[in-house]
């Protein structure tokens, strides 16, 4: 029999550490799964934000310009209509995500930066101007938010929360990277992460999760965006690359 | 097409108010703030104000607050310009416009 | 508020002429400065827009320039149908407000 679970691999049954895990999942539940993405834009130059009223300019990184955020945001829509099969029945991320406020708002916690814009190509285009100015646009609603995640209106002219569909903030740093201090607006990656439900001793609702993350593979190794390099993983990644180096050996 | 289609001309006797409009087509007033520009004959142009339709939110140039209303109804895609207590000095083209893109004009006449 | 000023208030030239009408902000606008032509009975047209940038369908002849409080736009080798009054305008924020014009006549 070959071992690959990551937790049976790298820690002794009979350990403190394997113990006091035991005892947590037992009494608390697993730790939730976590598919991640890292999104870079290679192909896109950093760029100013002037605002409004004579403000010093502010830097927006490459993966925080406006045509890119949209098209993050149609990736990240597609990942949550990836769908998979487990004993004939229809796996959806919506059927094993993370949603804390349950049953009164069913929404998946996405932590992404597209959820200051409560992940909504209408919202991120919501601006006040006329054709010549703009005083207030995603720029602005932006830097609002990676300083206030938890607010309900950003006080510019926009009004618009920060608050993510799932009823909850979104801290700047786990969305964002290659940031400097706390200047988020340099961020030079963006990071998408879906929390998914883990189960203690309950192996189908385990492989539901897995055949999800399997698509989930799937779809974003062959998908196709020139303006985008994505790196990824599944909670399922180390195990699939310990079964691989398995069968290789 | 982007297009604004101002009013007819008015023909109105001093003390008395009027409302000008002004229908886009080719998009949504509210995607835009919207300007009000005046023109005596044979002067400049100075602006009057402007409305965001989203909210109704407005400002205006002090010289023209009490004088000068300026509405939305986002249903009709139409901004509106009332002017009040029209004088001799209200006797001007008055343009709509969202930057890029004006009205035609309409000519307000005030005489008794 | 900002206020423009423009200059000269006329000017007659010929056809094939270049002219220079200049424009002065009384505080930084930046680049935030449009040209428009207007001729008689006519609404404005825009000609330029953040101080330098053509608007649609406007000839190359016209350019704008200049960033800050000074700014200018010219036209090179006048056509007939080039002749009218030019306003600047400043388009940081608002109030808008409008240079008092220059009418440019056939020499």
């Known amino acids: 029999r070959v071992t690959t679970n990551p937790v049976d691999l790298w820690s002794a049954p009979s350990s403190q550490a394997r113990l006091e895990k035991e005892y947590f999942d037992q009494h608390f539940g697993p730790f939730f799964r976590t598919e991640q993405l890292i999104i870079r834009a290679p192909l896109t130059d950093k760029h100013i934000y002037q605002p409004y009223p004579s403000g010093a300019d502010v830097p927006f990184g490459p993966p925080l310009d406006i045509q890119i955020l949209h098209q993050v945001l149609d990736l990240q829509i597609a990942i949550e209509n990836i769908t998979a099969s487990y004993d004939n029945e229809t796996v959806t991320l919506q059927d094993i995500c993370l949603a804390p406020l349950s049953p009164y708002n069913t929404n998946c916690t996405i932590l992404s930066v597209l959820n200051y814009f409560q992940n909504s190509h209408s919202v991120l285009d919501h601006k006040k101007g006329d054709d010549f100015f703009v005083y207030a646009d995603y720029h602005t609603h932006f830097l609002y938010c990676v300083r206030a995640p938890a607010s309900l209106n950003d006080t510019s002219l926009l009004h618009d929360p920060c608050l993510g569909t799932f009823g909850g903030p979104v801290f700047p740093w786990l969305v964002l990277g290659g940031y400097d201090d706390q200047n988020y607006n340099n961020a030079t990656a963006l990071v998408i992460t879906f929390p998914v439900n883990n189960y203690y001793n309950d192996t189908e609702k385990l492989q539901r999760a897995q055949a999800w993350e399997k698509e989930f593979i799937n779809f974003v190794k062959n998908y196709k965006n020139p303006n985008l390099t994505i790196s990824f993983t599944a909670e399922r990644s180390i195990e699939d690359e310990l079964n691989r180096e398995s069968d290789s050996d | 097409e982007v297009q604004l289609q101002q009013s007819g001309a008015e023909l109105v006797k001093p003390g008395a108010s009027v409302k000008l409009s002004c229908t886009a087509s080719?998009?949504?007033?509210?995607?835009?703030?919207m300007h009000w520009v005046k023109q005596r004959p044979e002067e400049g142009l100075e602006w009057i104000g402007r409305i965001d339709p989203a909210d109704g939110n407005t400002e205006y140039v002090p010289k023209f607050q009490g004088k000068a209303t300026i509405t939305a109804d986002t249903f009709s895609n139409t901004v509106y310009l009332q002017l009040s207590g029209l004088t001799s000095e209200d006797t001007a083209v008055y343009y709509c416009?969202?930057?890029?893109?004006w009205g035609q004009g309409t000519t307000l006449t005030v005489s008794s | 508020d900002i206020q423009m000023t423009q200059s000269p208030a006329s000017l007659s030239a010929s056809v094939g002429e270049t002219v220079t009408i200049t424009c002065r902000a009384s505080e930084n606008i930046y680049s935030y400065l449009a040209w428009y032509q207007q001729k008689q009975g006519k609404s404005p047209q825009l000609l330029v827009y953040n101080a330098k940038t053509l608007a649609e369908g406007v000839p190359s002849r016209f350019s704008g320039s200049g960033s800050g409080t000074q700014f200018s736009l010219k036209i090179n080798s006048l056509q007939p149908e080039d002749f009218g009054i030019y306003y600047c305008q400043h388009h940081y924020g608002s109030p808008w407000a409008f240079g008092g014009g220059t009418k440019l006549e056939i020499k």
């Open positions: 080719g998009f949504n007033i509210k995607d835009t703030y």
């Open positions: 416009s969202r930057g890029y893109y």
